[in-house]
């Protein structure tokens, strides 16, 4: 039994890191393998993660971690019984994939303005709380070409757009994702999408 693709890990910079790897053949990850991990810290203890299958030869492990700080470094040991298959380390702050924003809501009761709001996925004491920026994706269910991205580079988790920038009388969907420039993170997954019917009064045309 050998590791074909070494574990690569990403952290949500809060409490979970996810590590994925591939073996050289079909493997029952949960029965044959264990991933041991430990924060390099005087007051830390070793933890064991039981991996799950992720395709025939792929494995994935969700590591429960202490609140992350930038200096953290974890040792990782992948075991098959008594055999050490791979040894490595992981700095969560260097491999961050933020949590997805939640509670995306479209408020349509503001005069001819759409207000989209969502929740920051981090608590106020987390470093990323004040460092997230967002991308909002809006698309038409009727017209695949009607697809747009709004970059929200301010901290407030909201976006205002004129309803008239979208077509009236049809349904739209929106979703939002996050990233943090300070740690050069990847983008989060998209939030669940939300749907609304866009309607607004056309301005009266004079001839």
């Amino acid at each position: 039994m050998k590791v074909l693709q070494e574990p690569t890990c990403v952290s949500d910079y809060m409490s979970i890191s996810t590590c994925e790897w591939k073996m050289n053949g079909p493997t029952n990850c949960s029965t044959e393998l264990r991933l041991l991990y430990q924060l390099v810290f005087l007051l830390s203890e070793a933890h064991t993660c039981i991996p799950e299958n992720n395709g025939g030869a792929g494995c994935v492990c969700h590591l429960l971690m202490d609140d992350v700080v930038s200096a953290d470094n974890y040792t990782l040991d992948l075991w098959a019984g008594q055999q050490l298959l791979w040894k490595g380390s992981f700095k969560p702050s260097e491999h961050v994939k933020p949590r997805a924003p939640g509670n995306l809501t479209v408020h349509t009761n503001v005069s001819d303005t759409l207000l989209l709001t969502w929740s920051n996925p981090y608590p106020p004491d987390n470093y990323l709380y004040n460092h997230l920026t967002y991308a909002v994706n809006i698309w038409s269910e009727n017209d695949p070409a009607d697809f747009r991205i709004y970059n929200v580079t301010y901290l407030e988790p909201s976006l205002r757009i004129a309803a008239s920038t979208l077509k009236s009388g049809i349904s739209y969907r929106a979703r939002v994702r996050a990233w943090a420039q300070c740690y050069n993170t990847t983008w989060s997954e998209w939030s669940p999408s939300t749907k609304w019917h866009n309607s607004y009064r056309e301005p009266f045309e004079q001839h």
Partner: antibody, heavy 115, light 109 residues
């Protein structure tokens, strides 16, 4: 807002015992290492003890064998049991959250050791 | 055990002046594990700088940290009246734990 609220200081005779408490709020207590740091009157800061998320502990040589740090994650609370107290243990004791450094501190509680 | 020595013991300056505080370690310290604190009379210490040069949340940009190895510096670019206090450096070591310097008092001249 992260808060650490301390209680339990007071006057004790040499050789006596005292238990300090620290209640945390505004953060996930169970995912953070916690510490006690003290400051003798007019002196600098001295690290006393720390406890990891899994219960691993460490002590300064000056208190080893006499002080015991513990935590109750269900109550978001940190404790310091101080036995065989000496005159040199007299100080303001602070609880703190942290790891390699201490990012949030309690208000401090005075422990006076005097006969 | 790593010993941190701060200098000067006392720094007498006027508001608006630049303050430079030194922290010297008896052996090399990882920059990731060097921090600075401010303490005012009757108050708990407050984290200013961690990782030798990163400002803690809410700390004004007139505070900056620098250095590596055994020599570290805290600089206050223009002293405000509320900056007069005692400043401590602190390090963490995987074997010895946590130690503080003896402090530098920044007082009004």
């Amino acid at each position: 807002e992260v808060q650490l609220v301390q209680s339990g200081g007071g006057l004790v005779h040499p050789g006596g015992s005292l238990r300090l408490s620290c209640a945390g709020s505004g953060f996930t207590f169970s995912r953070n290492a916690m510490f006690w740091v003290r400051q003798a009157p007019g002196k600098g800061l001295e690290w006393v003890s720390g406890i990891g998320t899994g219960g691993a502990t460490n002590y300064a040589d000056s208190v080893k064998g006499r002080f015991t740090i513990s935590r109750d994650n269900a109550k978001n609370s940190l404790y310091l049991q101080m036995n065989s107290l000496r005159a040199e243990d007299m100080a303001v004791y602070y609880c703190a959250r942290g790891r390699y450094y201490f990012d949030y501190w309690g208000q401090g509680t005075l422990v006076t050791v005097s006969s | 055990e790593i010993v941190l020595t701060q200098s000067p013991g006392t720094l007498s300056l006027s508001p608006g002046e630049r303050a430079t505080l030194s922290c010297r370690a008896s052996q090399s310290v990882s920059s990731s594990y060097l921090a600075w604190y401010q303490q005012k009379p009757g108050q708990a210490p407050r984290l200013l700088i961690f990782g030798a040069s990163s400002r803690a949340p809410g700390i004004p940009d007139r505070f900056s940290g620098s250095g590596s190895g055994t020599d570290f510096t805290l600089t206050i670019s223009r002293l405000e009246p509320e900056d007069f206090a005692v400043y401590y450096c602190q390090q963490y070591d995987h074997s010895a734990g946590w130690t503080f310097g003896q402090g530098t008092k920044v007082e009004i001249k």
